[in-house]
Amino acid sequence: DTHKSEVAHRFKDLGEEHFKGLVLVAFSQYLQQCPFEEHVKLVNEVTEFAKTCVADESAENCDKSLHTLFGDKLCTVATLRETYGEMADCCAKQEPERNECFLQHKDDNPNLPPLVRPEVDVMCTAFHDNEATFLKKYLYEVARRHPYFYAPELLFFAARYKAAFAECCQAADKAACLLPKLDELRDEGKASSAKQRLKCASLQKFGDRAFKAWAVARLSQKFPKAEFAEVSKLVTDLTKVHTECCHGDLLECADDRADLAKYMCENQDSISSKLKECCDKPLLEKSHCLAEVENDEMPADLPSLAADYVESKDVCKNYAEAKDVFLGMFLYEYARRHPDYSVMLLLRLAKAYEATLEKCCAAADPHECYAKVFDEFQPLVEEPQNLVKQNCELFEQLGEYKFQNALLVRYTKKVPQVSTPTLVEVSRNLGKVGAKCCKLPEAKRMPCAEDYLSVVLNRLCVLHEKTPVSEKVTKCCTESLVNRRPCFSALELDEAYVPKAFNAETFTFHADMCTLSEKEKQVKKQTALVELVKHKPKATKEQLKGVMDNFAAFVEKCCKADDKEACFAEEGPKFVAASQAALA
């Protein structure tokens, strides 16, 4: 349905509060270095303009596309060239090239200071003094650090952020009430950002066919009672929503997401019995709840897949008639029967099935050729099962910190060219899979673990794409989305790597180490561990363990000393010398 004024249409659909929030997010995700006040000014100008269009859709410029309106507004920023360099060249282009240009300049690792959390009283005062500005600041700070954050979901986080302050700033012990809530929002927010980044990478690097396949598998697991046609409709709608958000079309995305939530709640009977509790909630909460809803129970009477997909003599005929539909049906049928498989595994099975049909349907006796296709799935299934089993055993044996260290060593040996901060960040997150998934029952371990690892490895791929240093990483990241994790798992010690020269400065520590939080201390130690492996890639586990134990003892000793700085100055070189000797 066409509207005379797109901006008026979206303003009316979304309401002023959500409209302003989404425009602020869009602008902050594009111009990540701009000061808060500049963005607020731009948003207010756009909002006033939208209101004139609501009053009269025929008013001047109201018929322009949102990309044109927003792009024109962004290009009025005076310091564009000085702050963003070549991104300013985008403004010389016409739509749609201009928007594509802005998208290409989104920075996944912007050079922004880490967010420091002020004292609780300071935050509560700021919240009470100007609630609207306080919440806008939250949207701005998150959006500029996470340029692909799922915008309608960020509005939900902001609503929870507001609720936390409203409740806790009145509590007797404000800190005890507020800090755990803020920690939870921070951790959930980082996870949400990373999950959305994988969706956008899937769409942008591998196309909507890859995203649709992912969505068919995931929704079929969630809604095993739904018909294939119903799942297909949801997949089509969900693909549109995420394509829009990943493309910077945040108003359309939020509007379409609301429509999808409405449709799902109006058609619960043909989708899932688990939607009821979500559908009574207000919009933002409802959409979040629907996205996170647990898997419905599997129908009791599902027949064997073999009849239609192996034993039937019509397999090649059905495949030829509509390849993607037939493969989609296969994926749907397999996924609804296997909530215990990761989505990535299901996609690998569908890919293997497709390859078999491509080969066998060209044979004179296709049926004989594809008769054993399900047997070929066994090694594909066993590989992630074994990986999860082995790594969960290692996690239970070592605990999270030492498990992260084992992964740090493993990944540094695989891809030593990758920057140390990236290796530390990615390996720490890979290590969190243990606490997240290993405590779950067997049937939930693989989907939890492998699909989480896919999200973390996507972060490695995104950071590496910005500064490519390793052909191995490029290969694993670009060849196949579904085989990324197995590709990284299969990498071994890089024999071609020339060890990094020893730099004493890297292993020089000071008394400020003692005032760091436990997490910051771990990161310091893990940074040193990566540097050690880069210096001695063939060091054994025992050698590295010895050095790290000595390091922990040295830091503990100096942090207990009266003159901490003197202790670090004196003991530091001894530690370095002993470490070099141990690794010689």
Epitope: V315, A320, C361, A364, P366
Partner: nanobody, 115 residues
Amino acid sequence: QVQLVESGGGLVQPGGSLRLSCAASGFSFGSFGMSWVRQAPGKGPEWVSAIDSGGADTRYAETVKGRFTISRDNAKKTLYLQMNSLKPEDTAVYYCTIGRSTSRGSQGTQVTVSS
């Protein structure tokens, strides 16, 4: 939409010959093995012959081996069945299928062998 249209059938005396053709459209013909299947009055479908996508590998039912020859022209998207030394028991509707399917996805062409 997949379409298979058979032609070349007719009435022939025992010992005679016929050449059936099957024109394909709506799918990548050159990527699929193809078969000929027949159905005699009051009987179920019977697989006759198959050929792989490139035309190198051919298979035949014992009842027609040495008399029938399957071939294909991928450029013309056409499948053929050369039938020699025809017998009364070869009387049936002949139709082509994708792969080794025996389900009728087309009208077929009638072959009658009678003196």
